[in-house]
Every structure is written in structure tokens, then in C-alpha cells.
């Protein structure tokens, strides 16, 4: 469902495996038209901050919410599985008021025990007046957030405040940050894993530990696989995102929990309050911090960040700027790959991975982050492909 940044015209959808364009009416129609079959792989998505389940309709060439009538948890788990989540991650199936939806996908109970997508049909009515909301993983929940603190020149984070934050080590040294999205998968920055660090055996991930001195051999998790975004550009830092798969899944607890990946339909506002965290330097050209630090930052709209006096058109749609134009608060060396998060509906969402900046905390040089919203489809594809 590569609608964003597709090489195809408005009416076409691109196959990832071949780059060819197919008609949207062939997308999710039960027949594979792409060589890799990906036109039938991503027919479900979660939409907006309420995780509303939507199914793509090849007839209407658009996404529609699923009516709650006759829905059950088994269908919910199947939909999450189709997105790339494993059964044992499944959290719950909720119900949300349809809030003015006029077109639904509904289960045809007389269709027999066919697969889920064969059972769904269009309906302009939904008798329960409720649509399906799915939590494929219990994500985005933390203990009370940290007190005001800063990565550059600030205070430390509180235990459990940023439970998705990991420290990624190479040979017992902190190199980059990362964010837990499932028990097995970590989001980090592609520039962290440039050759020769693209080999998984270099890397160990530490979760739930705030102090670097407590990160000793045996407490870490070995990395099994490193997947860098195929379109990452090391010069411009465009598409600066990577995934790490752990050899053994993490055990979640109060100090180790996943952050939520953003859903389509989540609108980010300029000046939206966000947080960054990491063990990066607390001053430009400084050493890695012993303790995890966190800071409040504001989103800066791309147009403003691309202005001549800031980054002069270096910011692409795959990047987000955050910080303060007057400086003082910023991520720094060693924070790379770590999270830029925001809270909506009492849930924490991963909207950026720390990527680059000119110096640290300088005026008119805010932090630049990978725009995770642009990469969620790619992330889910990797999770799916890994099975």
C-alpha cells in the first residue's frame, strides 16, 4: 500500500519487488499481481490514535473501518498477524464509536468459515454503531514521565519513564540509542549501522537499565539481524532508519516496554510537545553520559526548518525537525537512533529516530529526526517477511 512517495501516477500503486505499477482495483483483490505478492499482503491497517482497524477495498479503491458486528478476537489476531505482529503480542480488541463513518466493511456471517478478507463486504450501515479498534501489542505505556530534564546540560530520566529506550553497544561501548517496538524488534538509525557495523554480531542491546556502568556482559541482548533502509543516503541522511532483530525476545516489565508506531491519520502539529532521550553527550564534543537523560522539545514545521536561516532545504519528507530555534535543548552525539516521542490519548508514539544536526543545541540548528510515519509500512514489511 505504497501510496506515499510512489513512482506511479495517482491512480497506480507500486510493487516493491519489481517497481511496476498496478491498478488500485487489483490491490487486495485476492489475486497476486506483484511478483512478490505484496499487493495481497497489506490489506489491513490501523488508523489514527484510536487504532481503528481499516481494510482496503479494491472495489472502492479506498480504506474503510470494520464494523464491530459479529467480529471476534480471532479475526483481530489474524489482522494483527497480517500486519507483521506475532500472536503472542496481541493485546486486545476494543470498540470505538463509529463517529460519523458512512461506509464500512462488515462480516458476512452467511459466507461460511472462509478467510477473513473473503468474509468482508461493503455496507453503508453498522447496526452496533461501533467500529473495531485493535491493539496488536500493548505499547506506549510508561510509568510517570520524567521530570523536566535535558540531554544537553540536564537532569537524568526516572526509572520506567522511557521504557522503550535501549542502549546499543559495540564492544562494550555505547554507540547509539534505539526504541523497542516489539519484544524482538528495535528501531534505530541507519547511520548507526553503516559498514562495517552492519554485521549483527557487533551489536548488543541493553533495555531497562538507566546507567551505562550497569550494562555489563550477560545483561544484554545479542542482535540477530540488522536491516538498514534500502534508500538510506549516507551523505544527506535521507531515510535514516534501521531495524535490529534480537536473537532472544525481551521480557516486558515496568522498565522494559514497547513504544507505539504511529498510525496513518495521526496529524502532527507544529510546536507539538515531544520528548527525546538518550545517553548522548551532554555538551557538544562531550563524552557519552553515564545516565539516561531526556528533554522536552517542540516540533518545528518542515517549511520553517528548510528556511535559509535554518537548514536551507536539506530537510526531506523523510525527516522531522524538533527542538528550539533559540538552541539550549537538543540531542547530541551518542543519542543517534534513539526516540523522539509524543503523547496522544495517553499513549506514547514513536514519531522520530534521532538522525543528525549541526552541532548540539545551537541556535537555528535544531535536531533532525527520521520521520517514522513515512517508514511504518517498511517496518511492518520487514516484520512480516521475517515471519
Amino acid at each position: 500500500w505504497k501510496f506515499m512517495g510512489s513512482k506511479c501516477s495517482n491512480s497506480g500503486i507500486e510493487c516493491d519487488s519489481s517497481g511496476t505499477c498496478i491498478n488500485p482495483s487489483n490491490w487486495c483483490d485476492g489475486v497476486s499481481h506483484c511478483p512478490g505478492g505484496e499487493d495481497e499482503n497489506r490489506c489491513v491497517r490501523l488508523y489514527g490514535p484510536n487504532f481503528i482497524l481499516q481494510v482496503y477495498s479494491s472495489q472502492r479503491k479506498s480504506w474503510h473501518p470494520v464494523c464491530q458486528d459479529d467480529w471476534n478476537e480471532n479475526y483481530g489476531r489474524a489482522a494483527c498477524r497480517d500486519m507483521g505482529y506475532k500472536n503472542n503480542f496481541y493485546s486486545s480488541q476494543g470498540i470505538v464509536d463509529d463517529s460519523g463513518s458512512t461506509s464500512f466493511m462488515k462480516l458476512n456471517t452467511s459466507a461460511g468459515n472462509v478467510d477473513i478478507y473473503k468474509k468482508l463486504y461493503h455496507s453503508d450501515a453498522c447496526s452496533s454503531k461501533a467500529v473495531v479498534s485493535l491493539r496488536c501489542i500493548a505499547c506506549g505505556v510508561n510509568l510517570n514521565s520524567s521530570r523536566q530534564s535535558r540531554i544537553v546540560g540536564g537532569e537524568s530520566a526516572l526509572p520506567g519513564a522511557w521504557p522503550w529506550q535501549v542502549s546499543l553497544h559495540v564492544q562494550n561501548v555505547h554507540v547509539c540509542g534505539g526504541s523497542i517496538i516489539t519484544p524482538e524488534w528495535i528501531v534505530t538509525a541507519a547511520h548507526c549501522v553503516e559498514k562495517p557495523l552492519n554485521n549483527p554480531w557487533h551489536w548488543t542491546a541493553f533495555a531497562g537499565i538507566l546507567r551505562q556502568s550497569f550494562m555489563f556482559y550477560g545483561a544484554g541482548y545479542q542482535v540477530e539481524k540488522v536491516i538498514s533502509h534500502p534508500n538510506y543516503d549516507s551523505k544527506t541522511k535521507n531515510n535514516d532508519i534501521a531495524l535490529m532483530k534480537l536473537q532472544k525476545p525481551l521480557t516486558f516489565n515496568d522498565l522494559v516496554k514497547p513504544v507505539c508506531l504511529p498510525n496513518p491519520g495521526m496529524m502532527l502539529q507544529p510546536e507539538q510537545l515531544c520528548w527525546i532521550s538518550g545517553w548522548g553527550a551532554t555538551e557538544e564534543k562531550g563524552k557519552t553520559s553515564e545516565v539516561l537523560n531526556a528533554a522536552k522539545v517542540l516540533l518545528i514545521e518542515t517549511q520553517r526548518c528548510n528556511s535559509r536561516y535554518v537548514y536551507d532545504n536539506l530537510i526531506t519528507p523523510a525527516m522531522i525537525c524538533a527542538g528550539f530555534l533559540q538552541g539550549n535543548v537538543d540531542s547530541c552525539q551518542g543519542d543517534s537512533g534513539g526516540p523522539l516521542v509524543t503523547s496522544k490519548n495517553n499513549i506514547w508514539w514513536l514519531i522520530g529516530d534521532t538522525s543528525w544536526g549541526s552541532g548540539c543545541a545551537k541556535a537555528y540548528r535544531p535536531g533532525v529526526y527520521g520521520n517514522v510515519m513515512v517508514f511504518t509500512d517498511w517496518i511492518y514489511r520487514q516484520m512480516r517477511a521475517d515471519g
Epitope: G30, D70, N72, N74, A78, D82, N113, V114, Y117
Partner: antibody, heavy 117, light 106 residues
Framework: QVQLVQSGAEVKKPGASVRVSCKAS????????ITWVRQAPGQGLEWMGG????????EYAEKFQGRVSMTTDTSTTTAYLELRSLKSDDTAVYFC??????????WGQGTLVTVSS | EIVMTQSPATLSVSPGERATLSCRAS??????LAWYQQKPGQAPSLLIY???TRATGIPARFSGSGSGTEFTLTISSLQSEDFAVYFC????????FGQGTKVEIK
Amino acid sequence: QVQLVQSGAEVKKPGASVRVSCKASGYTFTNYGITWVRQAPGQGLEWMGGISVYNGNTEYAEKFQGRVSMTTDTSTTTAYLELRSLKSDDTAVYFCARGQLDYFDPWGQGTLVTVSS
Amino acid sequence: EIVMTQSPATLSVSPGERATLSCRASQSVRSNLAWYQQKPGQAPSLLIYGASTRATGIPARFSGSGSGTEFTLTISSLQSEDFAVYFCLQYNNWWTFGQGTKVEIK
């Protein structure tokens, strides 16, 4: 008419593996999942897991995780159950059935697997 | 895990009489319940799905009712071919079968 025909009875030693096949006919194979259920002698029915023929996704009962594999071959419209590291209490009739997300209908005739040293 | 409890374990009924079988879920399964009949040496066959919808070809003497946690299968007038074991299956969250009710000739 819709039919599921299973392979014949098997006798296996403890620690061995068994592979049971289930040949489907009379319907569009990829439109339905296949579920496997077993029934020990004189006992009730136990859900083992299922596979979506449409996309190959599997779902296994926790009890069998790591020991079971379910696969399908769309060219021959056949589903397969493989159970490894067999123990004597795996002695049962193994049924395949059409459907994977809700109820199951119809069922294969069953395959008796006896595990004995 | 949702536990399905069937009662009674055995039901002795004369041909032509009414039989009422019960199935209770440990938590709500809404209407996601099916009933199966199994005869010795055979595979189970579907009678009812969605708690109350008769499967294709099932005689009208079989009826299902209930929702949530309490379900009933009623056979209005038992025929000789109806003596068998009956299982319920919940398919709301994973899949669990009841232990079965044997309907035998009185």
C-alpha cells in the same frame, strides 16, 4: 461436494516425527484456512492450530509451539501437519478441518497416530 | 484460556423425547459458538454455528440458543440416528471445545 481426505494410520516410536496429509477437494482451496484437531482415545477434542492457505500465516496452540508445523501445497490442494519429538501421549486420532478463524466444517475422516516403543 | 463446560456428561433419553444439552463458557464468547455431533469411529459434523444457525442439511429438530456464557442445544424429538456424543466449540478467542455430552438410549 466438499471433501477432506487424510493419509493412513501411522505407528511411530517415541522421539520420532509424523507427517499427516489432508487432501482438499470440491472448493476453492485458497479461500479457506485449515485447522488441525486431535482426539486421544476416549477423550475430547483438542485444538492444535491452523493455517491460512491464503497467506500462509499459522497459529499454534501454546502446548504444541516449537514441536508442530502446519503447511499447505496449493498446487495439490493438500495441507500437512508435522509433529516432532513424539511421546506416548501423542497417541490420538488427528483430524484436519476446513476453516481457521471461526468454526470448522467439514472435517477429514481422521488419521490414527500410535506412538509406542 | 476460555473453559467450556458441558452438562450433563451423559443424557439418557427415549426415542421421540426431547433432549436439552447445556454448554457454559468461563467468560463471554458472545454468539461465537458451534455444536458438533460425533458418532463412534467418525469425525465430528457441524450442527449449529453462531449459537443458533443450523448448518446446511441439518434437520429442524436441532436448535441452538443462548449468547454470552450460557448456551443450549435442543433436539426436539430424538431419532435413532441422533444417539451420539455432542461437543460445543467456542471460537471467540482462540478455540476450545467442551468435554462432550453423550446422548444414549434410555
